[in-house]
Amino acid sequence: LKGQEFAPSHQQVYAPLRADGDKPRAHLTVVRQTPTQHFKNQFPALHWEHELGLAFTKNRMNYTNKFLLIPESGDYFIYSQVTFRGMTSECSEIRQAGRPNKPDSITVVITKVTDSYPEPTQLLMGTKSVCEVGSNWFQPIYLGAMFSLQEGDKLMVNVSDISLVDYTKEDKTFFGAFLL
Amino acid sequence: LKGQEFAPSHQQVYAPLRADGDKPRAHLTVVRQTPTQHFKNQFPALHWEHELGLAFTKNRMNYTNKFLLIPESGDYFIYSQVTFRGMTSECSEIRQAGRPNKPDSITVVITKVTDSYPEPTQLLMGTKSVCEVGSNWFQPIYLGAMFSLQEGDKLMVNVSDISLVDYTKEDKTFFGAFLL
Amino acid sequence: LKGQEFAPSHQQVYAPLRADGDKPRAHLTVVRQTPTQHFKNQFPALHWEHELGLAFTKNRMNYTNKFLLIPESGDYFIYSQVTFRGMTSECSEIRQAGRPNKPDSITVVITKVTDSYPEPTQLLMGTKSVCEVGSNWFQPIYLGAMFSLQEGDKLMVNVSDISLVDYTKEDKTFFGAFLL
């Protein structure tokens, strides 16, 4: 009798339960970027540290060749911060035909690549005009949100100008994802 | 027979399972910072509201003396926003020897202190140059990421200038962490 | 005897366990806002895409009439990014009687509405002065934190000026929440 009472309740939730500690997770940190060629009109991808310092990958979440590889389908929280730094951007000085300039800008995109799909999908974008007069400047762009991903999907972080990325400290520029 | 089939499966996942509702969690909100002395070249730590309004700590996550105390080892998502406000910062005016000024800046650091380790670890940093001409200014810096923490670790939020923190509303400046 | 040993241990964690995959979750993405009347001194709410592209709601988390409806009590992580864009804001140029102007600003608020409570609660606010000289500007405000919500609570995103919201891409402006 006791067994009969217990079984249905157990069956009701048993199948999908899984231990939190074995979920795929990664936190990647900045490394100095080696200048690389990239296609025109395509933002270059950052590469990352995946095991030293604060960085880690675990539970089958692997990092390879600028990509985080999603090992199982589910809903993931994905985040990144990129700190940019540059010299003065005198975007207010020169106007042609009375029109304001197209401003300088900095952009971060978190992109999903699915092998069976021809085009990458932009999941998150942070983009900011930069109009700093008279001094060096620096500022972060932070992004984070939840997405439904499929096993085999790949994630990368693209930036508008790799030469402006602050690669000096692992706490300034980073990229991570975890299965919810 | 049924019992024999069931036992191994149960043992397989039973040990690490735990209820989501009993995981350590905290969301702390800003209070006015009383002016206090701090060491030179060391960013002061903010103190926080931990039980009134939107603020809470639960499941053995405790707040004491500017620190969130980590009650069990695991992967935590940690976040903070600090809203800064100040008066005009005419950083573009004076250049020496044709060089741009070192700009004014605002910085937030989420720091981990481990008693067995001599130096605090900077987990997250958001830093931004401020070059606002002609008016009062205000802006937030947001940070958030996942880290592997150990029982007994302590977390704090440090800022570059405590006098520029907007302490007026609990939704503007906050700090939180939760076990994944 | 074996049953007696097993039962207490099972009872200890059984009741609150639940499958991660059936937790309420939503990620909403921007759509073009139709101009609507709103009360003076009250920020207008954005409406959202909830099923096309990257957007989804699941497990009884429903979207209706600008609100995300919370289907069960618990601790939720809530986030939003709004990208603003506008024309030059020459806030530094004109001063009356030597006094600085009140700066232009952009603000995002994530608000909770509880039917049994007369006033909405501001959970998160990101607010930034905008003083861009000489060019069009664009920039995101990102917010995210954990809150204890009750079944029936409603969440919305309010902005200071709906006409400045960049509605062009689903990765630039978004709103989400998930039960922890």
């Epitope: - | 406000r85 009062n136 006098s163 923190v165 007026t168 509303k169 | -």
Partner: antibody, heavy 117, light 107 residues
């Protein structure tokens, strides 16, 4: 435009309570703390204390036992009460806005309070 | 409480000259120091905060420097409207305290 205006009696008898009010206009009251500062004739400035829109106060320890600062958000005003006054409390009393934090960027024009019998 | 001491008590200068005012704290206040200007019959006006940051709308001839215990306010070329009393204020510790003032008068 931010404006602060002090009001209250200019003469108070010794041992009585000095009461002043500051009316605030042109600004969101809840975004700041609001302070009282005084200046005895020909002397320097002394911070008395401050308050926010929720009524949370900070007082100068040297005056704490005699000072009460209160707020009436419906009227956008805050008040100072200083009990058991003596001639040493004779001063110009200013109200001021605290921005961004423990600095005073807008001031009232000040009101002279004389303590005399 | 932190004591703030200003020197000199009075500074007699002509328009166009450079004025240098000093403020010393009894213990370190880091860079949490402000300067105010007060003219007769008027309320004080915030000039400098953070030891060296000019407040909104303050002319560039006013500059501040120093950190720790010793601070300086400099007026590069005195204008007629600059003759007034100047106060320093520390906001590193509670209670907030002001110096006794330096009067800048026309020579």
């Amino acid at each position: 435009e931010v404006q602060l205006q002090e009001s209250g009696p200019g003469l108070v008898k010794p041992s009585e309570t000095l009461s002043l009010t500051c009316a605030v206009s042109g600004v969101s009251y809840s975004d700041y703390h609001w302070a009282w500062i005084r200046q005895p004739p020909g002397k320097g400035l002394e911070w008395i204390g401050d308050i926010n829109h929720k009524g949370k106060t900070n007082y100068n320890p040297s005056l704490k036992s005699r000072v009460t600062i209160s707020v009436d958000t419906s009227k956008n005003q805050f008040s100072l009460k200083l009990s058991s006054v003596t001639a040493a409390d004779t001063a110009v009393y200013y109200c001021a806005r605290d921005y961004p934090n423990f600095l005073f960027d807008y001031w009232g024009q000040g009101t002279l309070v004389t303590v005399s019998s | 409480a932190i004591q703030m001491t200003q020197s000199p008590g009075t500074l007699s200068l002509s328009p166009g000259e450079r004025a240098t005012l000093s403020c010393r704290a009894s213990q370190s206040v880091s860079s949490h120091l402000a300067w105010y200007q007060q003219k007769p019959g008027q309320a004080p006006r915030l000039l400098i905060y953070g030891a060296s940051r000019r407040a909104t709308g303050i002319p560039a001839r006013f500059s501040g420097s120093g950190s720790g215990t010793d601070f300086t306010l400099t007026i590069s070329r005195l204008e007629p409207e600059d003759f007034a009393v100047y106060y320093c204020q520390q906001y590193a510790d509670s209670p907030l305290t002001f110096g006794q003032g330096t009067k800048v008068e026309i020579k």
